[in-house]
């Protein structure tokens, strides 16, 4: 089953997020991803935990998963590099770098997204954009076209309340509000974009979606700049 969903969002403007990737398993959407360099897509490590012996590929330049689009192209994966400290039992270090079989053909609909290198928290209340092809309602309807939602960043202290995530949100993670509008594990690996810069990656831990007391959790990319640079080097 695909990991993740966007609840309470709307259809994105076609090809307005040229960095958006669909990580696919055996030809079906599995997770979101974000193009961070010509030959590299950033996603979530847990996405591939159940990939078993399947064929992992990356779809770039897509709005619709099923319809032909001139900019769409499916790339094989040369290398999957999970963060060395990612573990099956935790949401920490939930990052994965996928090296495409060749450099992506760039254009208006396919373009890497600059990612945050300055290791500073995004100000609470900042509106950030999250997009994905995850299911759009609790009945499990899967969208064919890319969806997105704007979410305000939530401060870590609130997110760490006992009634919320009870101290699980480390300095390397961030939260966004989840009151009916939310990302969830089917959108795992997708980008949280604030002010046109990649700030977070949707984690793929299991949690209730759309419940304001269980905010969305995102891995802060700035906290992993050294690792990302070392892999991309």
């Amino acid at each position: 089953p695909p990991r993740g969903r966007i609840l309470g969002g709307r259809e994105a403007e076609a090809h307005a997020r040229p960095y958006m990737a669909s990580v696919q398993l055996n030809g079906a959407h599995l997770c979101g991803g974000v193009l961070v360099a010509e030959q590299w897509v950033l996603s979530a490590a847990h996405c591939l935990e159940d990939a078993a012996d399947g064929k992992v590929q990356v779809l770039l330049g897509a709005h619709s998963l099923s319809q032909p689009e001139p900019s769409k192209r499916l790339y094989d994966v040369l290398r999957a590099v999970p963060h060395p400290d990612s573990q099956p039992d935790t949401i920490d270090h939930d990052l994965l770098l996928l090296q495409l079989s060749e450099k992506a053909t760039l254009g208006p609909a396919v373009r890497p997204l600059p990612w945050q290198r300055v290791d500073r928290d995004v100000a609470p209340g900042t509106l950030c954009d999250v997009a994905g092809w995850g299911i759009v309602n609790h009945a499990g309807r899967r969208p064919d076209s890319l969806q997105h939602v704007l979410l305000p960043v939530l401060d870590r202290a609130t997110c760490n309340r006992r009634t919320h995530h009870d101290g699980a949100i480390t300095e390397r993670l961030m939260c966004a509000e989840s009151n009916r509008r939310d990302s969830c594990k089917g959108d795992s690996g997708g980008p949280l974009v604030c002010g046109g810069v990649l700030e977070g990656v949707v984690t793929s831990g299991s949690r209730v979606c759309g419940n304001r007391k269980k905010p969305g959790i995102y891995t802060r990319v700035a906290s992993y700049a050294a690792w990302i640079d070392s892999v991309l080097a």
């Epitope: 490590a45 935990e49 012996d53 399947g54």
Partner: antibody, heavy 120, light 112 residues
Framework: EVQLVESGGGLVQPKGSLKLSCAAS????????MNWVRQAPGKGLEWVAR??????????YYADSVKDRFTISRDDSESMLYLQMNNLKTEDTAMYYC???????????WGTGTTVTVSS | DVLMTQTPLSLPVSLGDQASISCRSS???????????LEWYLQKPGQSPKLLIY???NRFSGVPDRFSGSGSGTDFTLKISRVEAEDLGVYYC?????????FGGGTKLEIK
């Protein structure tokens, strides 16, 4: 519950044949690569064979010690893994484990094993 | 074939002690995809083996954090920070980077 149950072991004479089976349940068998790993009495572990999934053309790999004598196969419709063992030798005497192969890791689920004894 | 050599063969420890097991490969076990498929398994008496560590240093699901893996290239180590009674058994290193896949000969962790 994820489970692997081996069967088909027993006593067989040298140069004889035996077919081991492994019934898988609790997971999408058809998406996983599968392996046989064996352990001779009082000895260590030895990887025997691996078969990949349909999406990887059911590619097979073997340890040098069993190549051309053993054949690994699978029936995805029945969630079954097999090991056909021909021209058996006394050194093939071992506990044979059916083992699931993950994506980030190799042997994450093991069966309880079936014993093969090759003796005259 | 890649030969995996484990030392020591037997490791007598007192409960609460730290234990360290070494595994050396006869050649580099960096896979062509850039990953190092070095794993550690524990086989308790009368049981099937269980995965502890994958890709050198990652703990598998449910494995206590007293277990840690390290190393690179051809030299790898498994450490148990405070040995408990349930840790006793035979530990095997394994390489999955090159076919045929190979296990180390095993290290028996026992009470001193």
């Amino acid at each position: 519950e994820v489970q692997l149950v081996e069967s088909g072991g027993g006593l067989v004479q040298p140069k004889g044949s035996l077919k081991l089976s492994c019934a898988a349940s609790g997971f999408s068998f058809n998406t996983y690569a599968m392996n046989w790993v064996r352990q001779a009495p009082g000895k260590g572990l030895e990887w025997v064979a691996r078969i990949r999934s349909k999406s990887n053309n059911y590619a097979t790999y073997y340890a040098d010690s069993v190549k051309d004598r053993f054949t690994i196969s699978r029936d995805d419709s029945e969630s079954m893994l097999y090991l056909q063992m021909n021209n058996l030798k006394t050194e093939d005497t071992a506990m044979y484990y059916c083992v699931r192969h993950g994506y980030y890791w190799y042997f994450d689920v093991w069966g309880t094993g079936t014993t093969v004894t090759v003796s005259s | 074939d890649v030969l995996m050599t484990q030392t020591p063969l037997s490791l007598p420890v007192s409960l609460g002690d730290q234990a360290s097991i070494s595994c050396r490969s006869s050649q580099s076990i960096v896979h062509s995809d850039g990953n190092t498929y070095l794993e550690w398994y524990l086989q308790k008496p009368g049981q099937s083996p269980k995965l502890l560590i994958y890709r050198v240093s990652n703990r598998f699901s449910g494995v206590p954090d007293r277990f840690s893996g390290s190393g690179s290239g051809t030299d790898f180590t498994l450490k148990i920070s405070r040995v408990e009674a349930e840790d006793l058994g035979v530990y095997y290193c394994f390489q999955g980077s090159h076919v045929p896949y190979t296990f180390g000969g095993g290290t028996k962790l026992e009470i001193k």
